[in-house]
Structures are given as C-alpha cells and as structure tokens.
C-alpha cells in the first residue's frame, strides 16, 4: 500500500484547513490509527491529534476544539483531518503516519502555507503646491504573507518607489508615488493596488489629488472703450483667476477710494450711472492660502461732448 | 502479555478529587493506547478517557471539564484526576491498554478499582 497525501496544503488565515492522509492499501489491509504531528526543522514531532480506528478522534490539548474529522461519510482508509480555523503559527510541517494491518507503517509529510490577506493603508503625502520640484503625492503601505505586491493606478504622471521589510511571518510592502505637481493634476484620482494570492481581488484605494495654485489675474470690461463714457449705466469689471483653494477677490482705487455707489460683489465691480470721478485706477487683489495676485486697470471716463478718445492702460502684476 | 494494576480508588465526597493510577508492564508496544472505563453497578462498562502516546485525549462527554487523563510514558504510568465528584460517577474504575494485535487492536485490562461518592 502507500499513502497519499498534497505536498501543499494553501489555506487563508481564518479558514478550516483539510489535512489530507489517504491510505491506498491492498484488499484485506485496515488502518489501525493515523496519527498527526507537527513536525518543523529544529524541533521536536509535537502530536496534532490521533485517529484511532477503535477509540475514535483523539487531539492533543494543544489543538482542543481545533482538530475535527471531516463530515461523513468517512472512508476507514482515510486518515485526513481539519484543522479549523488557521493562524499565521498553524503554517509548517506536517506529517501522517499511518500504522496499518498487517502492513505496518507509513509515513507522508505536507507542508500548510497560511495566507495572511493585507489591509493596506494609503497616506497622502505633503500638501502638494505647484511650482513644486518632485514630491510625495502618497505612500501605501500592506503587510501580508506572503509578501503583498504593491503598484499603482493613476494617470498621472509620476515616479515610484517600493521598499519591504521582512518580519518573522509576514512582510511589509511600501509604495512611494512622487509628481511634480500641476494645476491640471487637480481632482484626478491616484489609486493603490495591492494584490496578494489570499485576496479574490486586488484591493484599491483611491486618494484624489489637490494641487494649489494661483493663475494669472486679469480684468475684463474695458474691452470696448467708446463704451465707458458719461451716464452710461451697469458698467461693471470683472476679475478673471483660478486657484486651489478657490480664490477671494478683493477691488481697490490706487489713486483714492472706491467711489460712492460703486458696489463690490465678489469678483465683480458694477459701477452706477458713469461720471468723470470713477476714472481712475482700479487694483483687483486675488489669493488663496497659496499665493496672491494683481491686476489693475485705468479707467478713463469719456465726456461725449469732448472729442478726445478713452485711453486704456492694462497692467497685471504678480 | 501486559499486565494493568490500578491504585487510588476509595471513599469520597461529593464534590471531592480523586487519583487513580495504573501502572503498565509487558510487552509495551510504540503505537498503544491507554484509557480508563468503568461500571456502575447494573450497568454496562463505559469509556471515561483515553490517551495517545503523544499527549491527545478522548473523553465522555459526561466528565468533560471535571476529570483529565495523562501519562508518563517513561514510567509506563496512566492516571486518572478525577474533580467536582458526583454520586453518579460511583463505579468501578478499570485501566485499558490497547495494543496491536495481529488484524487489529488487543484491549489488556486491569483488575479494577473501586471509586465510591457519597456523603
């Protein structure tokens, strides 16, 4: 007769682990006991359990409650066993020795792999800034055994770097994401993937990018100058910018204060009925947490009964 | 051959502990089995406990938690702690060796001793 038994047994972590141990025997041959033990290099066979073909299950107060036979119906050549619930300490060797009339005994050994899932876990890096050089966007770290694989999904354009750090049982898998961030990086997604062969599917988490910035500051309204003329009414400006955070506005005269009657809404500056006092120069002052900008414009009041031209002077400063 | 001799039995109350002992001699093989059963008078013999030679255990569901079987096998020795006693486990206590024997397996016995609970 002989044994047969897997040379691998893969379990995941929590899950009833089958040890199997089936005695191929000539007819008339009978398996008088099957005893389990764990058998790793270094130390001594510690008994698992004992099956005896008289005395039913036995196990060892090590594994009380843990080692179970499989359901029936039960083959009395079958000596395999579960091993419920498996931790990380259950992986090593293992060996079925069957003890048989009149053949005597046989020995098998396999090896239980314990598959210990990640649970990773992404931290974003710096607030990122553009005009920044390369910087961390996000680190994601998984520890499993065996070791998890770490990559990432993004379109973004970015360098990676990985480290791990082995432990007695698991390993530790870091993954860096580095940019060079911009504007145009706002609000798009960046996901870690850490796939693992404990895992039905590869686990994602999904981080989305903020980059702060500030553009340009422009104003708009003064495109057509014949416009801007005495007693012309709803005359307004208009401060043009982005950013991240959302920018505030804020309008000031630089050559005094706002007129009276001029009203300041936001980004917007509406006029009441034009006169020849609201010509001056106004400054609209943008920023948000990262920066601040300039724009500012000459507005110059036409007086239809003069036949002197409107002059225009735009300045944006940073 | 094997010969069982058992020691410890007596008078107890309930509630009380008890030892038993059995030493083993003979022909001893590598792959035996040790237990204990016992019989109440009237009544058919029952499993208490058993034991491998590596340390797992079987017992009866009636004396799960109060009583624990071990071995020394270097002294060929099997005992019996019996705890929390109860007038129910009144019986005599026998010492069982299994050995392989031929097709299958040889239960040696011992001659008994006597475990009385009462108050």
């Known amino acids: 007769g002989e044994l047969e038994t897997s040379d691998v047994v893969t379990v995941v972590l929590g899950q009833d682990a089958k040890l199997p141990c089936f005695y191929r025997g000539d007819s008339g041959e009978q398996v008088g006991q099957v005893a389990w033990a764990r058998v790793d290099a270094g130390e001594g066979a510690q008994e698992l359990a004992l099956l005896h073909s008289k005395y039913g299950l036995h196990v060892s107060p090590a594994y009380e409650g843990r080692v179970e036979q499989p359901p029936p119906p039960r083959n009395p050549l079958d000596g395999s066993v579960l091993l419920r619930n498996a931790v990380q300490a259950d992986e090593g060797e293992y060996e079925c020795r069957v003890s048989t009339f009149p053949a005597g005994s046989f020995q098998a050994r396999l090896r239980l792999r314990v598959l210990v899932p990640p649970l990773p876990s992404l931290n974003p890096g710096p607030a990122l800034e553009e005009g920044q050089g390369l910087t961390l966007a996000a680190s994601c770290t998984a520890e499993g055994s065996p070791a998890p694989s770490v990559t990432w999904d993004t379109e973004v354009k970015g360098t990676t770097s990985s480290r791990s750090f082995k432990h007695s049982r698991s390993a530790a898998v870091t993954s860096e994401f580095h940019l060079v961030p911009s504007r145009s990086m706002n609000g798009q997604p960046l996901t870690c993937v850490v796939s693992h062969p404990g895992l039905l599917q590869d686990q994602r988490i999904t981080h989305i990018l903020h980059v702060s910035f500030l553009a340009e500051a422009s104003v708009r309204g003064l495109e057509d100058q014949n416009l801007w003329h005495i007693g012309r009414e709803g005359a307004m400006l208009k401060c043009l910018s982005e950013g991240q955070p959302p920018p505030s506005y804020n309008w000031t005269r630089l050559d005094g204060p706002l007129p009276s009657g001029v009203r300041v809404d936001g980004d917007t500056l509406g006029f009441p009925p034009l006169t020849t006092e609201h010509s001056g120069i106004y400054v609209c002052h943008v920023s948000n947490e990262f920066s601040s900008r300039d724009s500012q414009v000459t507005v110059d009041v036409l007086d239809p009964q003069e036949d002197s031209g409107k002059q225009v002077d735009l300045v944006s400063a940073s | 051959e094997v010969q069982l001799v058992e020691s410890g039995g007596g008078l107890v109350q309930p509630g009380g502990s008890l030892r038993l002992s059995c030493a083993a001699s003979g022909s001893i093989s590598s792959i035996n089995l040790m237990g204990w059963h016992r019989q109440a008078p009237g009544k058919q013999r029952e499993l208490v406990a058993t034991?491998?030679?590596?340390?797992?255990?079987n017992y009866a569901d009636s004396v799960k938690g109060r009583f624990t079987i071990s071995r020394d096998n270097g002294k060929n020795t099997l005992y019996l702690q019996m705890n929390s006693l109860r007038a129910e486990d009144t019986a005599a206590y026998y010492c069982?060796?299994?050995?392989?024997?031929?097709?299958?397996?040889?239960?040696?016995w011992g001659q008994g001793t006597q475990v009385t609970v009462s108050s």
């Open positions: 034991i491998t030679r590596g340390g797992s255990t």
């Open positions: 069982v060796d299994v050995e392989p024997s031929g097709m299958g397996w040889r239960d040696y």
